[in-house]
Amino acid sequence: FPQDRPFEDTCHGNPSHYYDKAVRRCCYRCPMGLFPTQQCPQRPTDCRKQCEPDYYLDEADRCTACVTCSRDDLVEKTPCAWNSSRVCECRPGMFCSTSAVNSCARCFFHSVCPAGMIVKFPGTAQKNTVCEPASPGVSPACASPENCKEPSSGTIPQAKPTPVSPATSSASTMPVRGGTRLAQEAASKLTRAPDSPSSVGRPSSDPGLSPTQPCPEGSGDCRKQCEPDYYLDEAGRCTACVSCSRDDLVEKTPCAWNSSRTCECRPGMICATSATNSCARCVPYPICAAETVTKPQDMAEKDTTFEAPPLGTQPDCNPTPENGEAPASTSPTQSLLVDSQASKTLPIPTSAPVALSSTGKPVLDAG
């Protein structure tokens, strides 16, 4: 179309733009390794990094593994999207006792109201059931907790009460925060969910805490205990350890109580697209060396840095992965580990006060 010539000409001589005949306009050329978010990008913000499936681009522009909802007590609330993690929540009939980033580290069954009492507020994925005394003359037997929802105010609610079967051993796993279970109850294996609405109170066992050694009442020698496959991050949150289950990944360091599992590309592969504690994309290790070498540094530092190889070691070839990014490492098993803390966060659970020590490790705040 001759009439398009003037528009096309405006792109010539500008290496950062190209002309798209389909939309008949000048488009911004995304830099190598970035992908357009629309057909004809106009500015750098219209370009973004492309993450592998089951990874998302976090606020710091890192490809970060989406959490998995594979535990039996979790269900997917929102899926893994290009710019946000999958979000897991406790499955119906359970509530979250210890929250984790985009997930729940510990789910408990909703409390069953004691015989004779009724449900004031049915449990949700985030909250336990609230029980209250029944009304005079009402037999506690309603078909579902929803039928027992109380009026907003009044003398005595005339709602139908809820079923009254006692909690069984599967109901939950922790003693109530208010007090100590008696041997008689323990022997009958009746257990209760942690159901205090507040962490304020007298010293007591908290469902999020596990003593590093027997923990005397009132002492600070307890640390928060996360579920298996979760670690306590620097902000005191239980965070899912990354999974190395992809064929091209191997475990470099295991999931520990205070650090994530780290994954690296399996022998014979190098990391093309880094991800927090892992590698989003591994590519076969090229015959020739890559253009960058990794500068060794203390593992305590957060970001790996790169420098040009020494003079005389420049490779004869320039292997690049299919998306045009240079490989991140020359070591067949090394992967680029960026900042170990994803920037998307959830509120810190209040069940355990955690402070950061001078080493950056979380410590329990005894105060």
Partner: antibody, heavy 121, light 107 residues
């Protein structure tokens, strides 16, 4: 530390309206499941539950006194109020406010120190 | 209203003794019962909830038992600091009701 403190006029005359205030600290009445009750104890006698207010502003009253009682709260100032109308000498007692913090059981883990009210002509 | 009949009203005891206080409910309260201790000039303090669960920090010489209409608070190896008044409370049905109290005195 959880504390509750009751304040009131101390002395009242029959047929007047009495206002009591429970000021608390160490917890919030906006916390899910939290609630505060008013309980009274005539000198040398047992305890009598009067009213309860929940975090969601739901209210419960003792039916025998319901027509004379109004419970309310100011979450931002950490206060719960009890208004008793048409007081009588039978209302002479020590008045306590107490916190219900369990979701499952309805007992009181913290109590205020109480204030004595004397209704006398 | 559910009436909680507490007995005895007074009980004389000595340090090291074992005592039991009972509460009889006028109708079934299941295990929805709490026990409180009140010393002269002080507010009540929670001891037991759900009939048999000891509240945090309460010494294990205090034990709650029973369900339905008969509830018991037992104190073994009585200490001088246990001399106080004890109340039961039912929370099975509104309105919440208390027993009249049992005063524990030194012989």
């Amino acid at each position: 530390e959880v504390t509750l403190k009751v304040s009131g006029p101390g002395i009242s005359q029959p047929s007047q309206t009495l206002s009591l205030t429970c000021s608390f600290s160490g917890f919030s009445l906006s916390t899910y499941g939290m609630g505060v009750s008013w309980i009274r104890q005539p000198s040398g006698k047992g305890l009598e539950w009067l009213a309860h207010i929940y975090w969601d502003d739901d209210k419960r009253y003792n039916p025998s006194l319901k027509s004379r009682l109004t419970i309310s709260k100011d979450t931002s100032s950490n206060q719960v109020f009890l208004k008793i109308t048409s007081v009588d000498t039978a209302d002479t007692a020590t008045y306590y406010c107490a916190r219900r913090a369990e979701l499952r059981d309805f007992y009181f883990d913290y109590w205020g120190q109480g204030t004595t009210l004397t209704v006398s002509s | 209203d559910i009436v909680m009949t507490q007995s005895p009203k007074f009980m004389s005891t000595s340090v090291g003794d074992r005592v039991s206080v009972t509460c009889k409910a006028s109708q079934n309260v299941n295990t929805n019962v709490a026990w409180y201790q009140q010393k002269p000039g002080q507010s009540p303090k929670a001891l037991i909830y759900s009939a048999s669960y000891r509240y945090s920090g309460v010494p294990d010489r205090f034990t709650g038992s029973g369900s339905g209409t008969d509830l018991t608070l037992t104190i073994i190896n009585i200490q001088s600091e246990d001399l106080a008044e004890y109340f039961c409370q039912q929370y099975n049905t509104y309105p919440l009701t208390f027993g009249v109290g049992t005063k524990l005195e030194l012989k």
